[in-house]
Every structure is written in structure tokens, then in C-alpha cells.
């Protein structure tokens, strides 16, 4: 299976971890598939929920992925880049705050450039409840990590804010920042940020980034 949409269409309609195959390759990767939300078939490419996984990782770790697909994890930039360059994908970002509120941003077009172009993110067609302005800069920026500084700031955003992300200078979001528990989650410049929903100092409780073919 190339993605969770193919898994779903094959008759596997239960949430869980499935083995996916890189496009035009025999290389495999394990991903969590959400088969219930919004019609199912979603490939989860990022999840934060409890702070159990360190997201201050190297370029190579963000490239190949890390964490546990059943919990907090990053699927891997290389797989997502290859997948989203095969056909048109949508990206849905689901957010939870500490007060029991939920919101989402849906981008009707999403792809990552190749590693040669630093896995630059490309997003179009924003809708949703998490802000009418995109908290990920448009047009997208190159991906940066603590050992791969590609942002637009002399300050090295990934080291300052922690985590790998498509930093601008440094920008209005970072879903891979430090995880702060409840009552420690405000006035944190390096937390899990989605500015156009909760502002600059609020660190979120949970985030999920998921992709699905646009023609699903």
C-alpha cells in the first residue's frame, strides 16, 4: 500500500498501524492510519499528545521518521515528499488546546519538495476553524532542524524554538516545539504553537497532521 487511502480502499477500515511502501520502491515504513475521521483513509504524518517523545531531532531523523506510530511520532520527510509528488494530496492539521477546544486547518493542496530543496512545504486552499490566515507561512519555507538551518532568521529558529519545522523568521507555527503540560503551557515562546488560533505564547495539548489524496 502506498498510503492509508489505499489501505482503506482494500477493505481495512480499522484505525491502526499499517505497513506502507515508498512509491516506486520496495522500501517500507510503518504509519498510523485514521480510518474514521472525515471518511477515513488518512495517513498520520505527525502526532503530539503527551510529551513522551523528544522532537528536537537531527535532519536525518526528520528525514526517515522517529517515534512510535501509535503515539507521538514524525512519519518522515522523505516518504511524505515522495508520496505527495505522485499525486495531489490534502493536508489536515487537527489541534487541541488545554480547555477542551478543538480546531483544524485544511489545505486542499499540499506537497513537500525533495531533500535537495530542503523539503520545502507548499500549501494552498486554506479552510478550517484554526484561523483564516495560515500559521504555516505561505509560500512555504524550507525545513530546518538543529543541525540543518534553512530558515530566514540569523537566530537559528530550530535551536531557539526547538524541533524541526518549516520556520520563517521564525514564523507563526511550530507543531514540533517543546511539549508543556497543563498550567505550564502559557507564555512559552518555544512550545507547540499555532499563532492564528491561540496566539504566540500558548502551547497546545495535542496536534495531528494527516494527509489523504484529494480524489479520495
Amino acid at each position: 500500500f502506498r498510503d492509508c487511502a489505499e489501505v482503506f480502499k482494500s477493505g481495512h477500515t480499522t484505525n491502526g498501524i499499517y505497513t506502507l511502501t515508498f512509491p516506486n520502491s520496495t522500501e517500507e515504513i510503518k504509519a498510523y492510519c485514521d480510518m474514521e475521521a472525515g471518511g477515513g483513509g488518512w495517513t498520520i504524518i505527525q502526532r503530539r499528545e503527551d510529551g513522551s517523545v523528544d522532537f528536537q531531532r537531527t535532519w536525518k531523523e526528520y528525514k526517515v521518521g522517529f517515534g512510535n506510530p501509535s503515539g507521538e511520532y514524525w512519519l518522515g520527510n522523505e516518504f511524505v515528499s515522495q508520496l505527495t509528488n505522485q499525486q495531489r494530496y490534502v493536508l489536515k492539521i487537527h489541534l487541541k488546546d488545554w480547555e477542551g477546544n478543538e480546531a483544524y486547518s485544511l489545505y486542499e493542496h499540499f506537497y513537500l519538495s525533495s531533500e535537495e530543496l530542503n523539503y520545502r512545504i507548499h500549501l494552498k486552499g486554506l479552510t478550517g476553524t484554526a484561523g483564516k490566515i495560515s500559521s504555516i507561512s505561505q509560500p512555504g519555507n524550507d525545513f530546518s532542524t538543529k543541525d540543518g538551518d534553512n530558515d530566514k532568521c540569523i537566530c537559528k529558529c530550530s535551536q531557539m524554538l526547538t524541533g524541526g519545522w518549516w520556520f520563517d523568521a521564525c514564523g507563526a507555527s511550530n507543531l514540533n516545539g517543546m511539549y508543556y503540560p497543563q498550567r505550564q503551557n502559557t507564555n512559552k515562546f518555544n512550545g507547540i504553537k499555532w499563532y492564528y488560533w491561540k496566539g504566540s505564547g500558548y502551547s497546545l495539548k495535542a496536534t495531528t497532521m494527516m494527509i489523504r489524496p484529494a480524489d479520495f
Epitope: 509528488n85 495531489r88 486542499e108 493542496h109 506537497y111 519538495s113 535537495e116 530543496l117 520545502r120 507548499h122 494552498k124 486552499g125 486554506l126 479552510t127 483564516k132 490566515i133 495560515s134 505561505q138 509560500p139
Partner: antibody, heavy 121, light 107 residues
Framework: DVQLQESGPGLVKPSQSLSLTCTVT?????????WNWIRQFPGNKLEWMGY???????SYNPSLKSRISITRDTSKNQFFLQLNSVTPEDTATYYC??????????????WGQGTSVTVSS | SIVMTQTPKLLLVSAGDRVTITCKAS??????VAWYQQKPGQSPKLLIY???NRYTGVPDRFTGSGYGTDFTFAISTVQAEDLAIYFC?????????FGGGTKLEIK
Amino acid sequence: DVQLQESGPGLVKPSQSLSLTCTVTGYSITSDYAWNWIRQFPGNKLEWMGYISYSGSTSYNPSLKSRISITRDTSKNQFFLQLNSVTPEDTATYYCARSTFGHYVSSMDYWGQGTSVTVSS
Amino acid sequence: SIVMTQTPKLLLVSAGDRVTITCKASQSASNDVAWYQQKPGQSPKLLIYYASNRYTGVPDRFTGSGYGTDFTFAISTVQAEDLAIYFCQQDYSSPPTFGGGTKLEIK
């Protein structure tokens, strides 16, 4: 710096084919983004015609779909417009331009200087 | 196709004035709207994209705003070199479509 340059005949006879070339320097057309043709009619109305993406996929304006083709020569870093069965209504200034997005229509950040084409017998 | 209705067609202003141009989309264009400037004898130049993002090197007197169907472009203090035609463009859905243009003339 990215530069685009259109070239081709300035006069085409009705019912013939219009062929234009866009030569790109400063960026590989196979790296990223989409590479577009836009035309501007007398009176300044702009019309997007179509693109070829870095991956080679194409998208065309439905109003032209039956008579337009966009191709490329990656070795020369060029892409091409062919418009068949032209009429005087195809008289316009033709621009090539780069999109800010690679897989879909988008705003265009780099434009050629344009080439004027007249369709007349 | 989404129709972009741009108003006004002509703006006659003095240097130092603030000007506003509007574009109304026939259906939602999300924030996928750009604004271009075309000076006489030149090709269009991108000024604003994703409704409100200023393109690299564009002076901050040029601003854009809007979401959905209503979009606004403004020049806070018009200068003589701003003499041009300004176009909006939606690229939310294919084919991308342009407004009819606003010609800015300096008194």
C-alpha cells in the same frame, strides 16, 4: 536570478499553428514549480492558458483545451506553447511565467518580457 | 470558472493619496488571491500573494487583505512611480482568473 525569455514569430496566418518558446535561465524547470503561459489581449485583459509542472504534468484552460499543447525540452531548460487553428482573436502579447506552486495553479513570481503575436492573413 | 470583479476601472489620484482597489470573487477563493502591477510597456509584477503576503522587495506601502470572496489592495501613500495597471488574480480553482484591471493615473 531567475529569468524567462519568450521567442517566436510575431505574425501567424489564420488557421495555422502558433508556436512559442520560453527559455529559462537561473533555475532548472525540473526542480520545482510550474511553468505557465499567459496572454494579454488588446485592452489589457489577461488569460491564463496553461502550465507544465516540474514533474512534466500539464494543465490547460478549458477554453483552449482542444487546441493547446505545452511541452518542454529539459536539456535546454525550455518549455513550449503550441496553439492550433488560430484566429484573429488570438492576437495578443504572450508571456511565460513561473508559478509559486508546483502541482497546481498559483500566483506567478517571475515573468518574461512578453512577445507580441498578430494573427492576420 | 471563478469570476473576479475588480473595481474601480480607473483611479485618478494625486501623489501622497491613499488608494484602495477591491476584487470580488464569484465564489470563495480562500486566501488564494494575488495582486500584480503592470507598468506601461512592461510585464506584470507580483506584489501580493496569498491575499496579504508582500512579495520580496515590495515596498510596505502596498498591502492586501481579504478572505473568501472579498479582497482589497491598498497603496498607503501613492508615489509617481506607482502609475500602472493593477490586477487581482485568484488561483484557488483552475483555471486561474484575473480581474479586469484598475488603471492608476496620477493627476
